[in-house]
Interface confidence: medium
């Protein structure tokens, strides 16, 4: 004799009893009415299962909750199924067996026929696991059922602090969707909140799970696929205050079927969004967007933000949204990088884009901007990176495209190519009134518009000029004069420089900022406009430093231990971290602080010039870093503002030194012998380079490095030209992760050292 191998299969679900009604007492597990009714309903469920062929496998069951409408019973039951039959008893098959029994004319005296009028249509059976039951049981001491009426915003009572886990069981009208809003009220906690597309905490129906007081998403809204949701809270550490506020609404299903015809222009024409964006998209999302282009000269570009698409094997589900575009199946995934999907138009002038959630697990709503591109020249003057669909500068010495193809097959890299014989000359020699090319082609077209390219400056009227770095040089190079606008910047207040010294003089670096918390210098920064200071994003990554309210910004400061008449201080009204900032890699390490009132410029307080995206800082150029950082690795911060000259290092060499961890948003400076470098406390401070015009331009922000001043390891700075578009967007009110959104890891509170 050999014992038959069985496996415990757990099913969860609900059924409606048409001849009973929900009462408030049934919503409270501790009430006598609940205990009595749940025992009877559990017996009814047991009898129902037992009267089918599943009866021989029956192990146990429980009715753990009741809901509104005709009385809805929420239950689970366990069957011990022979191993060989496991796959044949799917939730669908089990439901069918139970529905057949409910519809049968058998003359049983079981309560599901005599006492309870069970609605076969309303029977829901879902697959569950033993672990789901364990989680459910752990919440039963703090189990809250709420029915959400339409038009009502229902605040949910906070978790019971005596328990370690609570469950909110939410139900609304059948034709509506449940939408939960979660707002973290504290900056640090270790609580976990999980939301399920079911009445109970079924792992296979998990929509999202968040841990800790999430600074990435201080407020989040989450949609269920229908009228039921479960929210489970697990305590992280003891606290007298609720770490979050929960509220819930029942909302109508929003359609996302769109037909659009685009106009024959190349700028952004609109956006497509998942329903209730920026809410998490629902597990039942199915969007179909049909876009028509005006002619086959154009292709369609979809511009994503922190989300990208990639091909996936057909047998693999997309976990963050499935996209069908021109019969291509693509999976979405979250990324801290920009991405564009380019759709070439070949035979038809229309394309249908389908977005579907394939699993219950969802994510933040997806928004995609759309525009047209010229199919014959998708990236005028630049290189189309096929990996991410972006137009990137070509042959500038920086591998912008992950596969490096933008720097392949270059006749001249980070240099000007003479038209006569393809000789390469350095960029500062272009349009300098001295011919260097054989026939002087480097000095031609210097007074007129030229096709835009990697090193051409784009004027406000979108025309381009050949002269490198024409901004604020005292000569009007653009027809519209835009290269000489916004030039109240980059001039030193006083020129008494200590030659070869390390201590700065008053007014020498009038843009230098000291960012402080409770009188302690934490990071450097630079004034870039009358209400804006730029710094490094990693200065704010500690939970205790994330709030703008904590910070004071000092400008015109010389010494940390004393105040003098030339210095002014400001509170911070808003903090913007770059939305792609990633602490582990230090990528996009830039933040903007909006000051509480405008700065009045003086000899000791004035902004540095911001470079254009095309501004070329030449490797080998001597530039300066300033700050109150430590004067030796591990040492204390300096009292007096220090300055040090460093040389800009070619990207390829720096990248090799740091084993290819240097991204295109990074710039290296220093010396191979080390000695001169930034250090702790300098983070976010300016790396500035002086142009021949005498104006100082912001090339970088102190970001990270291996140690301080170590041989073979340069200082790594945020490359301002690669984040300038985001800076301008924030300065002109275009937003970009305001209020302090960031992510959770550890950087040193200032210059990053390993």
């Amino acid at each position: 004799y050999k014992a038959e191998v069985t496996v415990s299969q757990v099913y969860s679900g609900s059924l409606r009893v048409l001849n009973r009604h929900f009462s408030q007492d049934l919503g409270r597990r501790e009430s006598i009415a609940f205990r009595s009714e749940s025992a009877k309903a559990q017996k009814m469920l047991q009898e129902l299962v037992a009267s089918t062929r599943l009866g021989t496998y029956y192990n146990s069951s429980s009715v753990y909750s009741f809901g509104e409408g005709p009385l809805t019973c929420f239950f689970w039951f366990i069957l011990d199924i022979p191993e060989y039959q496991r796959l044949t008893l799917s939730p669908e098959v089990v439901r069918e067996l139970l529905v057949d029994e409910l519809l049968s004319n058998s003359s049983t005296l079981a309560s599901y026929k005599t006492e309870y009028e069970v609605d076969p249509e309303g029977l829901v059976i879902l697959e569950a696991s033993v672990n789901d039951i364990v989680v459910l049981n752990s919440t039963l001491g703090c189990y809250r059922y709420s029915y959400v009426n339409p038009g009502q915003v229902l605040p949910l009572k906070g978790p019971d602090q005596q328990t370690t886990s609570c469950l909110w069981h939410l139900q609304g009208p059948e034709d509506l969707m449940i939408k939960v809003r979660l707002e973290w009220t504290r900056v640090d906690c270790r609580d976990r909140v999980a939301m399920y597309d079911a009445a109970g905490p079924l792992e296979k129906r998990l929509i999202t799970s968040v841990y800790g007081c999430s600074r990435q998403e201080p407020v989040m809204e989450v949609l269920a696929s229908g009228s039921v949701m479960a929210v489970v809270w697990k305590k992280g550490m003891h606290s007298y205050y609720d770490p979050f506020l929960l509220s819930v609404k029942s909302v109508a299903f929003q359609d996302c079927q769109v037909n659009l015809t685009l106009e024959g222009r190349l700028d952004t024409q609109g956006f497509l969004r998942t329903p209730y964006y920026p809410s998490y998209y629902s597990p039942s999302t199915h969007c179909s967007w049909h876009l028509t282009v005006p002619s086959l000269d154009y292709g369609l570009a979809l511009w994503f933000d922190a989300y990208a698409l990639r091909r996936q094997k057909y047998n693999r589900l997309c976990t963050q949204g499935q996209w069908m575009i021109q019969n291509r199946r693509l999976c979405g995934f979250r990324t801290l990088q920009p991405y564009a999907e380019r759709i070439p138009m070949v035979a038809s002038d229309g394309v249908t884009i389908n977005f579907t959630s394939q699993i219950s697990l969802t994510g933040p709503g997806v928004q995609v901007y759309y525009s047209l591109y010229n199919q014959s020249d998708p990236c005028p003057g630049e290189f189309l990176c096929s990996v991410n669909g972006l137009c990137v500068p070509a042959c500038d010495g920086i591998k912008d495209c992950p596969n490096g193809l933008d720097e392949r097959n270059c006749v001249c890299r980070a240099m000007f190519q003479c038209q006569e014989d393809s000789t390469c000359i350095s960029l500062p020699r272009v349009c300098d009134r001295q011919p260097d090319c054989l026939n002087g082609s480097d000095e031609e077209q210097c007074q007129e518009g030229v096709p835009c390219g990697t090193f051409t400056f784009q004027c406000e009227d979108r025309s381009c000029v050949k002269k490198p770095n024409p901004e604020c040089d005292g000569q009007s190079d653009c027809r519209d004069g835009s290269d000489e606008q916004h030039c109240d910047c980059g001039l030193q207040g006083l020129s008494s420089r200590i030659v070869g010294g390390t201590v700065s003089s008053e007014g020498e670096w009038p843009w230098q900022a000291s960012l402080q918390i409770r009188g302690r210098h934490i990071c450097g920064g630079a004034l870039i406009a009358d209400r804006w200071v730029i710094t490094a994003a990693h200065c704010f990554q500690e939970d205790s430093m994330a709030s703008p309210k904590l910070w004071t910004v000092f400008l015109g400061k010389m010494r940390q231990n004393s105040r003098w008449p030339g210095e002014v201080s400001f509170k911070v009204s808003r903090l913007f971290l770059h939305p792609y900032h990633e602490e582990d890699s230090h990528d996009y390490d830039v933040a903007l602080l909006q000051l509480d009132h405008p700065v009045v410029y003086s000899a000791t307080v004035r902004p540095v010039c911001l470079p254009a995206r095309s501004h070329f800082f030449e490797p080998g150029q001597h530039c300066w870093i300033t700050g109150w950082g430590a004067q030796r690795e591990g040492g204390p911060v300096s009292n007096t503002l220090q300055k040090v000259d460093v040389q800009l290092v070619p990207q390829d060499l720096c990248s090799e030194a740091y084993r290819y961890q240097v991204s295109p948003r990074m710039l290296c400076a220093g010396y191979r012998k080390g000695k001169k470098d930034a250090c702790q406390g300098d983070s976010g401070g300016p790396l500035v380079c002086r142009e021949p015009s005498g104006r100082w331009f912001l090339a970088g922000l102190v970001s990270w490095g291996l140690g301080c001043g170590r041989p073979n390891f340069f200082g790594v700075y945020t490359r301002v030209t690669r984040v300038i578009n985001w800076i301008q967007q924030v300065l002109t009110g275009g937003g970009g992760s305001g209020g302090g959104g960031s992510h959770h890891h550890h950087h040193h509170g200032s210059h990053h050292h390993h």
């Epitope: 290092v649 090799e656 012998k673």
Partner: antibody
Amino acid sequence: EVQLVESGGGLIQAGRSLRLSCAASGFTFDEHVIYWVRQIPGKGLEWISSISWKSDIIAYADSVKGRFTISRDNAKNALYLQMNSLRAEDTALYYCAREKDGDFYYYYFAMDVWGQGTTVTVSS
Amino acid sequence: QSALTQPPSASGSPGQSVTLSCTGTSSDVGYYNYVSWYLQHPGKAPKLMIYEVSKRPSGVPDRFSGSKSANTASLTVSGLQAEDEADYYCSSYAGSNKVVFGGGTKVTVLG
């Protein structure tokens, strides 16, 4: 006067080992990358190895990798090349050369001071 | 790493110009701006004439100039003089701290 002087060359049987030395003077030795370059008589130059000033970055040409070892002693202003498993094709004039002076790049990958060379003849 | 390609010989009369080529790949000459040129007289050690494509060390006459286009670097010697007769070698950085040399060009000053 800035100077590099190689020594240690000679006639050696294939399969045997030899150690070349390079003595530096007239400059701050520990601030420079140093290279070994060889030249087969009547033929071109071949870079074979380089070592950074702190000995933390070392590189070899594929033709000698696993057989030759470069090292330096900054206290003695000396560079060494340990050559094992010598082959007939290693016969050449061996130069040591200094990285171009300057305090900026990781390397310039350019050699501004050369020794006069030491001859290694490997007999088979 | 394979050697850079240089023509075996080149010649010119005194006062004339001669241009020497050095062809590599997109992984060395084509990728990095670290091309050097050396002059070597018979029985002597090489002498650095050009580094980083076009820069001259102090003491090198401005008759020597370097340039680069795609995978090919060039050295131009203008106003050719008798003492310019020598072997000329190019070199390039090839990534991963490796350097590669060319096979050399023998320059003859005619007359």
